[in-house]
Interface confidence: low
Amino acid sequence: RAQLERSLRDVVEKTIQKYGTNPEETAAEESWDYVQFQLRCCGWHYPQDWFQVLILRGNGSEAHRVPCSCYNLSATNDSTILDKVILPQLSRLGHLARSRHSADICAVPAESHIYREGCAQGLQKWLHNN
């Protein structure tokens, strides 16, 4: 089990680092989006894992960006953000995120309504229970 956890972490690390770089190869990204969406988590240890991904990094004045699957809908009251940005992109995740052809990326607003927990613990619990 420990070996499986290490292997899973390695796969996730690679998926995060390569997120959005190849529109033709999105299977791993879509799977990870679905994990984040279902487990209500973001990144491996922290949402900050995404901030280092080159394709997601803005310049110093821009908001950090994360996959839209990181958004916590229940904590977001801003209907503009919900209707125009997040819901159209998250709606695809309801179909196991299989219809997506390119990475869906959302800016993190000043008030961070993204899942604050990384996915590591949830996935480790799932592995232990299965």
Partner: antibody, heavy 115, light 107 residues
């Protein structure tokens, strides 16, 4: 971004101390708040952190049971309370915000434990 | 707990020198490693996050490298304001731990 901590404290062994950290210049609930201490001439020791949005805490096992982290969202202030003080708790206590590494730190609060 | 071994514990160098500080962790921390600079009487300042990403406003003479268990902080050309103590820190698993520090002194 600014983190302003409360002033120096002198405490007796066995008592408690509560240090405050007032945040400004950013969204208080968007970052975790950590507490790190540094004994005179020594290295840095992470005590734990709190998520101001949900109130969840993570403690260093070494301090569990003695340290309590809280926040007051209305005033954007974090608090660290350390109980059952002993002489080896004499240190500078820092608050530091994070989403991952700690990017902004308070100026530090010296807590002296002496009989 | 993950142990952090920093070396050297102190070093003497001159302005313009290239300085390298290493940090070794007892377990794989992937890229969850930060470097901080601390001057006497001051709070630590974040220099590098995620092993190699320079924090905002940090001069380009600083660079970080490594992943897994072996990490390096390099100052390509030491400046007078760089004389300080440097700490590495992992933020991989609870509890976060720091290296014991490297004091960079004037030769």
């Amino acid at each position: 971004v600014q983190l302003v901590q409360s002033g120096a404290e002198v405490k007796k062994p066995g008592s408690s101390v509560k240090v405050s950290c007032k945040a400004s210049g950013y969204s208080f609930t968007g970052y975790n708040m950590n507490w790190v201490r540094q004994a005179p001439g020594q290295g840095l020791e992470w005590m734990g952190n709190i998520d101001p949005y949900y109130g969840g805490t993570t403690y260093n096992r070494k301090f569990k049971g003695r340290v309590t982290l809280t926040v007051d969202k209305s005033s954007s202030t974090a608090y660290m309370e350390l109980s059952s003080l002993r002489s080896e708790d004499t240190a500078v206590y820092y608050c530091a915000r994070s989403v991952g590494p700690m990017d902004y730190w308070g100026q530090g609060t010296l807590v002296t434990v002496s009989s | 707990d993950i142990q952090m071994t920093q070396s050297p514990s102190s070093l003497s160098a001159s302005v313009g020198d290239r300085v390298t500080i290493t940090c070794r962790t007892s377990e794989n921390v992937y890229s969850y490693l930060a470097w901080y600079q601390q001057k006497p009487g001051k709070a630590p300042k974040l220099l590098v996050s995620s092993a190699k990403t320079l924090a905002e406003g940090v001069p380009s003479r600083f660079s970080g490298s490594g992943s897994g268990t072996d990490f390096t902080l390099t100052i390509s050309s030491l400046q007078p304001e760089d004389f300080a103590t440097y700490f590495c820190q992992h933020h991989s698993d609870n509890p976060w731990t720091f290296g014991q520090g490297t004091k960079v002194e004037i030769k």
